[in-house]
């Protein structure tokens, strides 16, 4: 089933993503796509990487993250109801079936009406009990070559469901780990 | 160290082609990108493509795809910018810059440039 | 495509004095923006990249900051040999795009 995240009309939405590079420089393409992840590919990419770069991405979708490093976590500018429903992440490792497809339900509330003005909240989650891959820190050298063959090796689970949307910010260091290689 | 050595001055007349090469020394070829700028009189940086010597992968941009074509010689380090069809705005100093992860595939090392003049 | 756009095309700035220069992104580029001069007659030359890391060898008196659209480059104190056109450009991206240029005269 998806994990389940939330944001207010008019916030950005944060859906989180990482994956561990096999050594620096070996990134994965990486796509996202709204609709829940399909046998291949993502079905209406909104945004996509290749081994270097961003190469496609339509507005208000955008990665803010160290994405050469494994942050592929998709930010999504100025949310409308619209925007509701589900979004594949989706890391395109090399090999057949060997994808790690990560299915995210996006909710979006309407925005609410205070009395007083209150800081806005950019990133708002629930229940970070999610099957994510981390990125690492940087490398001081680079060495460029063939993806090897891959090994994912899932590491430690999460604790304890967030269900306070204001503990969002904390959700980059949740989830478990998917190294590659 | 770290060497961009690229072909000199070209004239061409509109509708031809121009091949510029660039020999890298001083680094594992392989292990770097080679992306391609160019800069018209007096005008900015405009990016043109890059090529990946290790699988020989391309990324060009849009605005030339069709008319250029990146392509490497791994046994002498050379990688080659082809550009056809030229027009009289293609008129500029075409750069081969090494890229790498290190560095956020930034430009670190820079050839001289190759001026490509195209005049009937 | 990203367009970067950088303020102001041109100043002139007395020795010894702080420098800053603008680049603006039309959409969130991240920390991805590096930072180029290039001298008369010279190739580009890389200072920033990832918004704020010197490169290997540049001069502790440039710095760079900035995420998202707005991002800064500044010369703590100008010296004779920063005269120079200085061009950001966004590594987020296919295609990579650079600002038009700032021109960096001594007053």
């Known amino acids: 089933s998806e994990v389940e995240y939330r944001a207010e009309v008019g916030q950005n939405a944060y859906l989180p993503c990482f994956y561990t590079p096999a050594a620096p420089g070996n990134l994965v393409p990486v796509c996202w796509g709204k609709g829940a992840c399909p046998v291949f590919e993502c079905g209406n990419v909104v945004l996509r990487t290749d081994e270097r770069d961003v190469n496609y991405w339509t507005s208000r979708y955008w990665l803010n993250g160290d994405f050469r490093k494994g942050d592929v976590s998709l930010t999504i500018e100025n949310v409308t109801l619209a925007d509701s429903g589900i979004y594949c992440c989706r890391i395109q490792i090399p090999g057949i079936m060997n994808d790690e497809k990560f299915n995210l339900k996006l909710v979006i509330k309407p925005a609410k009406v205070t009395p007083a003005p209150t800081r806005q909240r950019d990133f708002t989650a629930a229940f970070p009990r999610m099957l994510t891959t981390r990125g690492h820190g940087p490398a001081e050298t680079q060495t460029l070559g063939s993806l090897p063959d891959i090994n994912l090796t899932q590491i430690s689970t999460l604790a304890n469901e967030l269900r306070d949307s204001r503990l969002a910010n904390d959700l980059r260091d949740s989830g478990a780990t998917i190294r590659i290689g | 160290q770290v060497q961009l050595v690229q072909s000199g001055a070209e004239v061409k007349k509109p509708g031809a082609s121009v091949k510029v090469s660039c020999k890298a020394s001083?680094?594992?070829?392989?292990?770097?990108?080679m992306d391609w700028v160019r800069q018209a009189p007096g005008q900015g940086l405009e990016w043109l493509g890059y090529i990946y010597p290790n699988n020989g992968g391309t990324s060009y941009n849009q605005k030339f795809k069709g008319r250029v074509t990146m392509t490497t010689d791994k046994s002498t380090s050379t990688a080659y910018m082809e550009l056809r069809s030229l027009r009289s705005d293609d008129t500029a100093v075409y750069y081969c810059?090494?890229?790498?992860?290190?560095?956020?595939?930034?430009?670190?090392?820079w050839g001289q440039g190759t001026t490509v003049t195209v005049s009937s | 495509d990203i367009v970067m756009t950088q303020s102001p095309d041109s100043l002139a700035v007395s020795l010894g004095e702080r420098v800053t220069i603008n680049c603006k992104a039309s959409?969130?580029?991240?920390?991805?923006v590096a930072w180029y001069q290039q001298k008369p007659g010279q190739s580009p030359k890389l200072l920033i990249y990832?918004?704020?890391n010197r490169y290997t060898g540049v001069p502790d008196r440039f710095s760079g900051s900035g995420s998202g659209t707005d991002f800064t480059l500044t010369i703590s104190s100008l010296q004779a040999e920063d005269v120079a056109v200085y061009y950001c450009?966004?590594?987020?991206?296919?295609?990579?795009?650079f600002g038009q240029g700032t021109k960096l005269e001594i007053k």
């Open positions: 001083g680094y594992t070829f392989t292990d770097y990108y």
């Open positions: 810059a090494r890229s790498g992860y290190g560095n956020y595939y930034t430009m670190d090392y």
């Open positions: 450009q966004q590594h987020y991206s296919s295609p990579s795009t």
């Open positions: 990832y918004a704020s």
């Open positions: 959409q969130s580029v991240g920390n991805n």
